[in-house]
């Protein structure tokens, strides 16, 4: 793996204008399937993926202005089990609705300090941040 | 949304060593459920989430050394339909296995140019990059 600079002194070239996070317009990071109104344990026959899933979920906003991305969304399962494929409206206990987790790369804004301890701008600190991406219908584990 | 610097001149404080991408040790970004050997259309009763799912999937590596994260993983569905919760092996045509997409924030390393056009280091260019996170079992859309 190659490494390359991640720390950004507050002075010097390029200008503050160019130093903005994005060099292209970026809409708020909002999942296409975001639906805060879907709170029932049922699989819809239309709408976004998270409401049509037989392991339906909603999204919960996680905002941190000192992090990039500033907005992350955590999936929250609406049912403990999977919803029946036959009807989409009653649970089938043969399947569990489980969260799928992912360690996402994020960047935190941290002050940089010079050799004499003086403030020299902001560093980008790379971290792994655990987010829940979706709920997945799985067969329960068989305990051996 | 607040904005803060994302461009990193190649000279000046802090040192190249401190300018490495991560200020903490970071393991390779590899999903916990990564399993390149699971290529059959069946839902296991053990193993990682992507193999126990009734919409099982495998991961495909997408590496770009000029991007952060350098390694991304794309989900690839192993079945067109969902797998039966009853048997874990037969497909159930009442459900479709669909990819869940997400526009992930990534950063590309781009040369920064000075006022006179000379190379002044590397800028971090923020982009949205579409990745497939998982395969989800959904009820088919009902056409109105």
């Amino acid at each position: 793996y190659s490494h390359w600079p991640s720390c950004c002194p507050s002075k010097g070239y390029p200008s503050e204008e160019l130093l903005r996070w994005s060099t292209v317009p970026v809409p708020p990071l909002k999942p296409a399937s975001l639906d805060f109104h879907s709170v029932s344990c049922r699989a819809s026959e239309d709408g976004p993926l998270n409401s049509r899933a037989i392991s339906p979920w909603r999204y919960e906003l996680d905002r941190d202005l000192n992090r990039l991305p500033q907005d992350l969304y955590h999936a929250r399962c609406l049912c403990p089990h999977c919803v029946s494929l036959q009807t989409g409206s009653h649970m089938d206990p043969r399947g569990n609705s489980e969260l799928l987790y992912h360690n996402q790369t994020v960047f935190y804004r941290r002050p940089c300090h010079g050799k004499k301890g003086n403030h020299k701008g902001y560093c980008l600190e790379r971290r792994l941040y655990r987010v829940s991406l979706a709920c997945v219908c799985v067969r329960p584990r068989v305990m051996g | 949304y607040s904005h803060w610097p994302s461009c990193c001149p190649s000279k000046g404080y802090p040192s190249e060593e401190l300018l490495r991408w991560s200020t903490v040790p970071v393991p390779p970004l590899k999903p916990a459920s990564l399993d390149f050997h699971s290529v059959s259309c069946r839902a296991s009763e053990d193993g990682p989430l992507n193999s126990r799912a009734i919409s099982p999937w495998r991961y495909e590596l997408d590496r770009d050394l000029n991007r952060l994260p350098q390694d991304l993983y794309h989900a690839r569905c192993l079945c067109p339909h969902c797998v039966s919760l009853q048997t874990g092996s037969h497909m159930d045509p009442r459900g479709n296995s669909e990819l869940l997409y997400h526009n992930q924030t990534v950063f590309y390393r781009r040369p920064c140019h000075g006022k006179k056009g000379n190379h002044k280091g590397y800028c971090l260019e923020r982009r949205l990059y579409r990745v497939s996170l998982a395969c989800v079992c959904v009820r088919p859309r009902v056409m109105g």
């Epitope: 029946s84 009807t87 409206s89 009653h90 | 039966s84 092996s89 037969h90 045509p93």
Partner: antibody
């Protein structure tokens, strides 16, 4: 043996709400799924929807925006409300028990005798 | 929605003869995981509610005479009445319970010739 009996007005005005009740005897309403089905005069059968005692419902998409099925476990009854009715909703309305096995709905058995509802001004 | 199509619309058969009613679904109602066809047949006599005859495409409901039999798989199904009796005059409906919305065929009227 399980018996079902529909009751409610036989005449409803256009744009009003049709309301019917099904009284179940010989079985606890809490143990099964229950359904409404209708049959316009001289025509075929159309499934309206079902309910479980917990309130879990499923409606035919063609009627979904107008239908509400509810349950009253204390009276061993379940009910149908169909709003904004027109002449096309004139039909014999049946209630029926839905057989359930292996976590899936199956066939309808038994059925009530049915009640004719006419939509007319 | 799964569309159920019955044929013929009506059928006249001599007493003691065989009556055959067909039902076709717009998509398969067979599920491989349990090897079952999600199809039922009902009989409806004038002024009465439908009565279950056959479920799982070929299983006869208890109390139903053995002259009634169901067959077929996937999308094509048949209800056969061997040795038609006078009391069999009725309209017969097929119904799929593979997926909601649950749907019925248009019905086949069986009469005595």
């Amino acid at each position: 043996q399980v018996q079902l009996q529909e009751s409610g007005p036989g005449l409803v005005k256009p744009s009003e709400t049709l309301s019917l009740t099904c009284t179940v005897s010989g079985a606890s309403i809490s143990n099964y799924y229950w359904s409404w089905i209708r049959q316009p005069p001289g025509k075929g059968l159309e499934w309206i929807g079902y309910i479980f005692y917990s309130g879990n419902t499923n409606y035919n998409p063609s009627l979904k925006s107008r239908v509400t099925i509810s349950v009253d476990t204390s009276k061993n009854q379940f009910s149908l409300k169909l709003s904004s009715v027109t002449a096309a909703d004139t039909a014999v309305y049946y209630c029926a028990r839905v057989r359930f096995s292996d976590y899936e709905l199956n066939w309808f058995d038994p059925w009530g005798q049915g009640t004719l509802v006419t939509v007319s001004s | 929605d799964i569309v159920m199509t019955q044929s013929p619309d009506s059928l006249a058969v001599f007493l003691g003869e065989r009556a055959t009613i067909n039902c076709r679904s717009s998509q398969s109602v067979f599920l491989g995981s349990n090897n079952k066809n999600y199809l039922a047949w009902y009989q409806q006599k004038p002024g009465q509610p439908p009565k279950l005859l056959i479920y799982w495409a070929s299983s006869r409901e208890s109390g139903v005479p053995d002259r009634f039999s169901g067959s077929g798989s996937g999308t094509d199904f048949t209800l056969t009445i061997n040795s038609l009796q006078a009391e069999d005059v009725a309209v017969y409906y097929c119904q799929q319970y593979f997926i909601t919305p649950l749907t019925f065929g248009g019905g086949t009227k069986v009469e005595i010739k």
